[in-house]
């Protein structure tokens, strides 16, 4: 039975040209995290494998940095970066946990972070 929950940075906003940290945290489970995948809508951005370390998609290497921790740092933000981001935790023996973050990239300096919130665990992505 899957007992875990994923806490994420929730709905966040940032300024165009700036950077933002996407963070997820898996709690309430003793399952072993084997890999974390970061996805932007329908694109795979990065993989952090417990045995093999971080690997960033070649098409995003110039703007995506690993960390801190299992999080992901997006740099040189553009308005096109606005949208949904997913952290997918592959765990043993539980299976897959998915967290969702919505990022809005703003032209002005009105950007501010949303409150942290919890997403109930679920097995299927999207």
């Amino acid at each position: 039975m899957m007992t875990g929950t994923i806490e994420t940075t929730g709905n966040i906003s940032a300024e165009k040209g700036g950077s933002i940290i996407l963070q997820c945290h898996l709690s309430s489970t003793t399952a072993q995290v084997t890999q974390v995948n970061w996805e932007q809508q329908d694109q795979l951005l990065a993989i952090c494998n417990a045995d093999l370390g971080w690997h960033i998609s070649p098409s995003f290497k110039d703007r995506v940095a690993p960390g801190p921790g299992l999080g992901l740092t997006l740099q040189s933000l553009t308005v096109n970066d606005t949208g949904e981001y997913f952290c997918i935790y592959h765990t043993y023996p539980d299976g897959t946990y998915t967290g969702r973050i919505f990022l809005e990239v703003l032209e002005s300096s009105v950007a501010e972070h949303g409150a942290r919130f919890q997403i109930p665990h679920h097995h299927h992505h999207h």
Epitope: N37, I47, G53, H90
Partner: antibody, heavy 117, light 107 residues
Framework: EVQLVQSGAEVKKPGASVKVSCKAS????????IEWVRQAPGQRLEWMGV????????NYKEKFKGRVTITADKSSSTAYMELSSLRSEDTAVYYC??????????WGQGTTVTVSS | DIVMTQSPDSLAVSLGERATINCKAS??????VAWYQHKPGQSPKLLIY???YRYTGVPDRFSGSGSGTDFTLTISSLQAEDVAVYYC?????????FGGGTKVEIK
Amino acid sequence: EVQLVQSGAEVKKPGASVKVSCKASGYAFTNYLIEWVRQAPGQRLEWMGVINPGSGGTNYKEKFKGRVTITADKSSSTAYMELSSLRSEDTAVYYCARGEYFFFDYWGQGTTVTVSS
Amino acid sequence: DIVMTQSPDSLAVSLGERATINCKASQHVSTGVAWYQHKPGQSPKLLIYSASYRYTGVPDRFSGSGSGTDFTLTISSLQAEDVAVYYCQQHYNTPHTFGGGTKVEIK
């Protein structure tokens, strides 16, 4: 020029072990993964496992765990794949490949391993 | 393990015509799919990575598309040197499984 040069063909008896080497050149050995893939006659390509030569971290396909060991020697930029308790079904061409983001952009020439009594 | 199912098993196409190969993943793999060309007696060659990115030096008649579970490799105008077996591979999660291969021949 990136190159992966593998050791020569091997003929082994059932129950024996084989160790295949893969010497890398033309790039920073510790900056990329080395993956091992095999192809038995008439079969699809089969991923066996991978090593991060920088950290020494490994990951193996479940069916090979306990029977395969992948190592890397940073000083000689060489990776090794040792498969033990050989059986006839292990007869295959074994490839090493450079792993970039878990896809394989350069491949060795392949090493034929024949298991026969 | 994620199962990659390729179709068709073989394909005969006239020179200059389009060849389309499909690959279906048994579960979501985002854009974590690569395509390889494998000729007899040679090592496989990378054509496409991350579903749609053409690898360096690969002719632009090769293209890839798809996301999630359904992926396609297209050869827009088949050349004689394209005769080979083509494999999809998911690089989303270990073990990094391959499809069964599609043999492309000249009609």
